[in-house]
């Protein structure tokens, strides 16, 4: 059964030409997370498994950079880059939980952070 | 359509070298790890070497550790094994595939293999 | 010698089920993925089961994984004649970091 919940940075929006830290928490589970999957709509971004390491799809690489964690780090901004993002923990035994993330690039210099919320 | 191709198996005598290749297409090479697994006469699969996505993280067999090496170059979407201190217990039918996204979950496709004897 | 455990062959007639096992141990079955293969003579193997118990698009429904402690089993109900093959099971090893096979079980479709 699956008793986890993940946690995410929730909808946040950030400065064209900056940086953003998109982040996951999986809790209330004591189940191995085997791999991290990041991916934007339907594209990879990134995969983040406990064997192998880290790896930046080939399209993204200049732009996109591992971590803090199991997060990822998103970099020079455009406004193209506004959309959902999925974290997706394929864990043993539970199975795979799914976090969203919706991150809004704006031009201007206003750029306030969401609150955090929770995916069951 | 997905596809990989091996090529370069032949007639080597024992303690010579060879390098296998294995060509893909139809897909994001670098998104995928990648495996080799040989198949002897009349016996059954046995996983030989394992690549991760930019070839920093390599696993081998114990059969083959210290002889064989893998590699890949993504810039031209393929995958080597390079053989050395060839036996007679390596003759086989070498094929090399590709993992799963989430790299413990299978392997999902095959070549149609390449024939390596070994004998003097 | 195969680090996992598959009994040399197994047979059934038309339309009967018949299951295959694959016993492992606590490093790789009972912590990890297992998946399945199909190989018929003088060709490839092909993916029937990944991740213990799903089936990729296009591998009929009569296939099934299924995954209990250190044992995982693959299902065939409906047997056809096409179906007499070798099939392998596999898993990744935590402790020995490694791709382990099974021996291979040789179905024969009587």
């Known amino acids: 059964m699956m008793t986890g919940t993940i946690e995410t940075t929730g909808n946040i929006s950030a400065e064209k030409g900056g940086s953003i830290i998109l982040q996951c928490h999986l809790s209330s589970t004591t189940a191995q997370v085997t791999q991290v999957n990041w991916e934007q709509q339907d594209q990879l971004l990134a995969i983040c498994n406990a064997d192998l390491g880290w790896h930046i799809s080939p399209s993204f690489k200049d732009r996109v950079a591992p971590g803090p964690g199991l997060g990822l780090t998103l970099q020079s901004l455009t406004v193209n880059d506004t959309g959902e993002y999925f974290c997706i923990y394929h864990t043993y035994p539970d199975g795979t939980y799914t976090g969203r993330i919706f991150l809004e690039v704006l031009e201007s210099s206003v750029a306030e952070h969401g609150a955090r919320f929770q995916i069951p | 359509e997905v596809q990989l191709l091996e090529l370069g198996g032949s007639l080597v005598q024992p303690g010579g070298s060879l390098r296998l290749s294995c060509a893909a297409s139809?897909?994001?090479?670098?998104?995928?790890?990648m495996s080799w697994v040989r198949q002897a006469p009349g016996k059954g699969l046995e996983w030989v070497s394992l690549?991760?996505?930019?070839?920093?993280?390599?696993y081998y067999a114990d059969s083959v550790k210290g002889r064989f090496t893998i590699s890949r170059d993504n810039s031209k979407n393929t995958l080597y094994l390079q053989m050395n201190s060839l036996r007679a217990e390596d003759t086989a039918v070498y094929y090399c595939?590709?993992?799963?996204?989430?790299?413990?979950?299978?392997?999902?496709?095959w070549g149609q293999g390449t024939t390596v004897t070994v004998s003097s | 010698q195969s680090v996992l455990t598959q009994p040399l062959s197994a047979s059934g007639t038309p339309g009967q089920k018949v299951t295959i096992s694959c016993s492992g141990v606590?490093?790789?079955?009972?912590?990890?993925?297992v998946s399945w293969y199909q190989q018929l003579p003088g060709t490839a193997p092909k993916l029937l089961i990944y991740?213990?118990?799903q089936r990729p698009s296009g591998v009929p429904d009569r296939f099934s994984g299924s995954k209990s402690g250190t044992s995982a089993s693959l299902a065939i109900s409906g047997l056809q004649s096409e179906d007499e093959a070798d099939y392998y099971c596999?898993?990744?090893?935590?402790?020995?970091?490694?791709?382990?096979f099974g021996g291979g079980t040789k179905l024969t479709v009587l």
């Open positions: 595939a590709r993992h799963w996204i989430v790299f413990q979950y299978g392997l999902d496709v």
């Open positions: 139809g897909f994001t090479f670098d998104d995928y790890v």
């Open positions: 690549i991760n996505w930019n070839g920093d993280k390599t």
């Open positions: 606590s490093s790789n079955i009972e912590i990890k993925y």
């Open positions: 991740n213990s118990h």
């Open positions: 596999t898993s990744w090893d935590d402790r020995l970091k490694s791709w382990v």
